[in-house]
């Protein structure tokens, strides 16, 4: 089952996906697609990187983080209800059947008629490594928690642990890190 992420109509949506390059600049091809991950690659590709750069993208989809450090989280600009659905992040680690693939479910909610300011809770003690999105207009104001690095064997249980956690709502924009090499 997919981990669920939420955004409101008109906001920017954030779908986390990370890996740790084996060495600085030693990048791994990554693709993002609309729809669940197929057997290989991505379906309906919205963005892809190669060993050097972002080499394919479509409008409204971009990488806000430092992809050269393995932050390949996808930002979708000014979302509409049509952006709801499953997204695939595929990290194409070289080798025999080494790909890591993640299906992320994006739920778009109608915009609030009278948005009230919400109090941000401080989770710095529990998750000291915080990642705040860079400003791209007033729509994107949330603070995003970045989980500590974990190894591959922990990936599969991460989603369930988060979903069952009392912090799940506050951490729904958190991403796991894959360490390569």
């Amino acid at each position: 089952s997919e981990v669920e992420y939420r955004a409101e109509v008109g906001q920017n949506a954030y779908l986390p996906c990370f890996y740790t390059p084996a060495a600085p600049g030693n990048l791994v091809p990554v693709c993002w697609g609309k729809g669940a991950c197929p057997v290989f690659e991505c379906g309906n590709v919205v963005l892809r990187t190669d060993e050097r750069d972002v080499n394919y993208w479509t409008s409204r989809y971009w990488l806000n983080g430092d992809f050269r450090k393995g932050d390949v989280s996808l930002t979708i600009e000014n979302v509409t209800l049509a952006d709801s659905g499953i997204y695939c992040c595929r990290i194409q680690i070289p080798g025999i059947m080494n790909d890591e693939k993640f299906n992320l479910k994006l739920v778009i909610k109608p915009a609030k008629v009278t948005p009230a300011p919400t109090r941000q809770r401080d989770f710095t003690a529990a998750f000291p490594r915080m990642l705040t999105t860079r400003g791209h207009g007033p729509a994107e104001t949330q603070t995003l928690g970045s989980l500590p690095d974990i190894n591959l064997t922990q990936i599969s249980t991460l989603a369930n642990e988060l979903r069952d956690s009392r912090l799940a709502n506050d951490l729904r924009d958190s991403g796991a890190t894959i360490r390569i090499g």
């Epitope: 697609g33 669940a36 379906g43 309906n44 080798g95 059947m97 790909d99």
Partner: antibody, heavy 121, light 107 residues
């Protein structure tokens, strides 16, 4: 015109080895994933292996992963399948096929004419 | 492995008829289903991908439909050149698997 031409098939003894080649033309070979698919004498189709455009990522059917090796030479526009420890279940016509992937992964949009492999005891 | 159960195995038809071939996946495969046509002595030729998108040059009488686990290939107004074997394939998860085929024959 897209062309895929397999070669290297033949009669081989049980436990023997064979190397298949697929010469590609009419498209930018290095811009496509490539696959091997086989068709048994009973006409069943079975995916065997796939390799990414750069050759960096490789995928195998479980029953062949320790015996077959898929590779490619983008400079020569050629795809290969090295087969070893062959058994009777490997008897089939082997096709190479092209897999577009860049904006949308699509499996096997062009196929070669096939090369026949017969494993005899 | 995901099993693609294709029915029927054989189908007799006449020119001008409308025929349907179905494939049922043993697990959810979204719309990651392709259809191929194979004429005797030839290699398979792609017809449909993403369950319903026709490949370039494929006549409009071939239509694919379905999602999840149930998929259909329909040939409306069958022509003599359509007499062939048809295979479905899922490409949702590894290994990529094919149906056993449906042979379309003349009555």
């Amino acid at each position: 015109e897209v062309m895929l031409m397999e070669s290297g098939g033949g009669l081989v003894k049980l436990g023997g080895s064979l190397k298949l080649s697929c010469a590609a033309s009419g498209f930018t070979f290095s811009s496509y994933y490539m696959s091997w698919v086989r068709q048994t004498p009973e006409k069943r189709l079975e995916w065997v292996a796939t390799i990414s455009n750069s050759g960096g990522s490789i995928y195998y059917l479980d029953s062949v992963k320790d015996r077959f090796t898929i590779s490619r030479d983008n400079a020569k526009n050629t795809l290969y399948l090295q087969m070893s420890s062959l058994n009777s279940e490997d008897t089939a016509v082997y096709y190479c096929a092209r897999d577009p992937y860049y904006s949308n992964y699509v499996p096997m949009d062009y196929w070669g004419q096939g090369t026949s492999v017969t494993v005899s005891s | 492995s995901i099993v693609m159960t294709q029915t029927p195995k054989f189908m007799s038809t006449s020119v001008g008829d409308r025929v349907s071939v179905t494939c049922k996946a043993s697990q959810y495969v979204d719309t990651y289903v392709a259809w191929y046509q194979q004429k005797p002595g030839q290699s398979p030729k792609p017809l449909i991908y993403s369950a319903s998108t026709r490949h370039t040059g494929v006549p409009a009488r071939f239509t694919g439909s379905g999602s999840g686990t149930d998929f259909t290939l329909t040939i409306s107004n069958v022509q003599s050149e359509d007499l062939a074997e048809y295979f479905c394939a899922q490409y949702s998860s590894s290994p990529l698997t094919f149906g056993a085929g449906t042979k379309l024959e003349l009555k």
